[in-house]
C-alpha cells in the first residue's frame, strides 16, 4: 500500500468562452481508495478555490459554470490525490479561456444536388453555426471545414471553407451515395468534432467533371474559383 501516484490535468475545453471544463488522469491508486480534488487561483491572486462542480463533466473532471469563468484572467490549477498513506499533486496548469475554445459541431447541414439547365450539376451544401456561439458579438470568427466521400470509400476528401456557411462541389461519382460532414473552429482554438454524417444519393445521370472542382465563396452569385485536380491534391489533405 502506497500513496497515490501523480495525477495529470490533460485537457481543458470551453464550448463558447462562457464556461469550461478540465479533465485529469489519475496516477496509480497505491492500492487504496483515493480522493481527488482540484484547486485553483486566478493569476495575481493568492486566494485558493476548490472546483465548483465535479459532476457535469463526468468522472475526473471539474466544470466551471458562467459565474466561475472569466475570459480575461489566467487560471492556475492543480489536482491533489489523497489516500490513507499520503498525497500527491499534479503539476500546475495555466489556463486562459480564450485559447481553449472547442465549439460544438455546426448544425443543420443540408446537402442537395443542383442541376441547372445551363450549367454543370453540382453538390450544394449549407449549415448553421453551433447554437452556443454568438457570432454577432464579434468575439468569434468561426472557420469551417467540410469532408465528403462515397459511402464505401475509406478516404475522405476535405475542403477548407473559410468563414462561409455554404459550399459547392463539382466532380462527383454518379449513382453513389455520399457522406458529408462539417466541423468548425474559432480563430484561437480547437476544431470541433465532426457533425453527424448527412448522406445523399447522387443521381446516375449526374455529369462527372474529372478536370475541375468548383468551390464557391458564397451563394450561387458569389465569387467562384475553379481549382484543378492537381491543385486540389496539393492544397487539401485526404
Amino acid at each position: 500500500q502506497l500513496p497515490p501516484g501523480k495525477p495529470e490535468i490533460f485537457k481543458c475545453r470551453s464550448p463558447n468562452k462562457e464556461t469550461f471544463t478540465c479533465w485529469w488522469r489519475p496516477g496509480t491508486d497505491g492500492g487504496l481508495p483515493t480522493n481527488y480534488s482540484l484547486t485553483y487561483h486566478r493569476e495575481g491572486e493568492t486566494l485558493m478555490h476548490e472546483c465548483p462542480d465535479y459532476i457535469t463533466g463526468g468522472p475526473n473532471s471539474c466544470h466551471f459554470g458562467k459565474q466561475y469563468t472569466s475570459m480575461w484572467r489566467t487560471y492556475v490549477m492543480m489536482v491533489n490525490a489523497t489516500n490513507q498513506m499520503g498525497s500527491s499533486f499534479s503539476d500546475e496548469l495555466y489556463v486562459d479561456v480564450t485559447y481553449i475554445v472547442q465549439p460544438d459541431p455546426p448544425l443543420e447541414l443540408t446537402v442537395e444536388v443542383k442541376q441547372p439547365e445551363d450549367r454543370k450539376p453540382y453538390l450544394w451544401m449549407k449549415w448553421s453555426p453551433p447554437t452556443l456561439i454568438d457570432l454577432k458579438t464579434g468575439w468569434f470568427t468561426l472557420l469551417y471545414e467540410i469532408r465528403l466521400k462515397p459511402e464505401k470509400a475509406a478516404e475522405w476528401e476535405t475542403h477548407f471553407a473559410g468563414q462561409q456557411t455554404e459550399f459547392k462541389i463539382l466532380s462527383l461519382h454518379p449513382g453513389q451515395k455520399y457522406l458529408v460532414q462539417v466541423r468548425c473552429k474559432p480563430d484561437h482554438g480547437y476544431w470541433s468534432a465532426w457533425s453527424p454524417a448527412t448522406f445523399i444519393q447522387i443521381p446516375s445521370d449526374f455529369i462527372m467533371n474529372d478536370e475541375q472542382k468548383l468551390i464557391s465563396e458564397e451563394d450561387l452569385g458569389g465569387e467562384q474559383k475553379l481549382i484543378s485536380e492537381e491543385d486540389l491534391h496539393h492544397h487539401h489533405h485526404h
Partner: antibody
Framework: QVQLVQSGAEVQKPGASVKVSCKVS????????IHWVRQAPGKGLEWMGN????????IHAQKFQGRVTMTGDTSTDTAYMELSSLRSEDTAVYYC???????WGQGTLVTVSS | EIVMTQSPATLSVSPGERATLSCRAS??????LAWYQQKPGQAPRLLLY???TRATGIPARFSGSGSGTEFTLTISSLQSEDFALYYC?????????FGGGTKVEIK
C-alpha cells in the same frame, strides 16, 4: 453485401463490465463509422454513441459518460463497445449500426442480474 | 439534446388504407431525419433518410415529408407486412435521438 455480425448473448452481474463485438464484412471498418444503439425489453431505441475508426474519434450520449468505451480493430474489421459498472437497467439488446443506418447487426442481448 | 416526439402512440388502420405518422423535433433538424420500421424480435430497418429519400429496396408506398421540426411518414396503402413499430430519428447534431415510436396495428 454488407453485414454486421455481433457476438452472442451475455449475462453479467451488477457492477461488472460487458464487451460486445461487431464484425463487419463486405466493407472495411476504416470506411464505416459505427453507431451503437440499445433497446431495453419492451422499450424504444436509445442511441449510445458513435465510433469513427478512421480517426479513432468517439462521441457518446452524456448518460454513458465514463461508462462506455468504443473501439475498433481495423486488422479484423471488428468494432467493440464496452459498458462498465453495469446495473439492472442496462439489460437490453445492443445493436451496432453502420453510419448510414441501413446496416444493422442482429443485436446482442445483455442481461444484468444478480 | 433534441427531443423527438411521435404521434399517435398507436394507430389502428385497416389493410389497404392510408396511414399517416407524425414526428416533431424540439428544435430544427433541417432534413436530417430518418424513419425506421421494426418488427418483433428483429433489428430496425431503415425506410427513409433525408426526411424523404427512400432507402434501397423500400417500396414506393412509403413516403416522407417535412423539414425543420415537423415530419410525416405516409404509408399509402397498408399491406399486411406493414403492421409494425415505426421510429423517427434525427441526425442533425450530437447526440442523435429517437422518437418514442408509433405502433401501427390492424383495425
Amino acid at each position: 453485401q454488407v453485414q454486421l455480425v455481433q457476438s452472442g448473448a451475455e449475462v453479467q452481474k451488477p457492477g461488472a463490465s460487458v464487451k460486445v463485438s461487431c464484425k463487419v464484412s463486405g466493407y472495411t471498418l476504416t470506411a464505416l463509422s459505427i453507431h451503437w444503439v440499445r433497446q431495453a425489453p419492451g422499450k424504444g431505441l436509445e442511441w449510445m454513441g458513435n465510433f469513427d475508426p478512421g480517426d479513432g474519434e468517439t462521441i457518446h450520449a452524456q448518460k454513458f459518460q465514463g461508462r462506455v468505451t468504443m473501439t475498433g480493430d481495423t486488422s479484423t474489421d471488428t468494432a467493440y463497445m464496452e459498458l462498465s459498472s453495469l446495473r439492472s437497467e442496462d439489460t437490453a439488446v445492443y445493436y451496432c449500426v453502420g453510419v448510414t443506418f441501413d446496416y444493422w447487426g442482429q443485436g446482442t442481448l445483455v442481461t444484468v442480474s444478480s | 439534446e433534441i427531443v423527438m416526439t411521435q404521434s399517435p402512440a398507436t394507430l389502428s388502420v385497416s389493410p389497404g388504407e392510408r396511414a399517416t405518422l407524425s414526428c416533431r423535433a424540439s428544435q430544427s433538424v433541417a432534413s436530417n431525419l430518418a424513419w425506421y420500421q421494426q418488427k418483433p424480435g428483429q433489428a430496425p430497418r431503415l425506410l427513409l433518410y433525408g426526411a424523404s429519400t427512400r432507402a434501397t429496396g423500400i417500396p414506393a408506398r412509403f413516403s416522407g415529408s417535412g423539414s425543420g421540426t415537423e415530419f410525416t411518414l405516409t404509408i399509402s396503402s397498408l399491406q399486411s407486412e406493414d403492421f409494425a413499430l415505426y421510429y423517427c430519428q434525427h441526425y442533425n447534431n450530437w447526440p442523435l435521438t429517437f422518437g418514442g415510436g408509433t405502433k401501427v396495428e390492424i383495425k
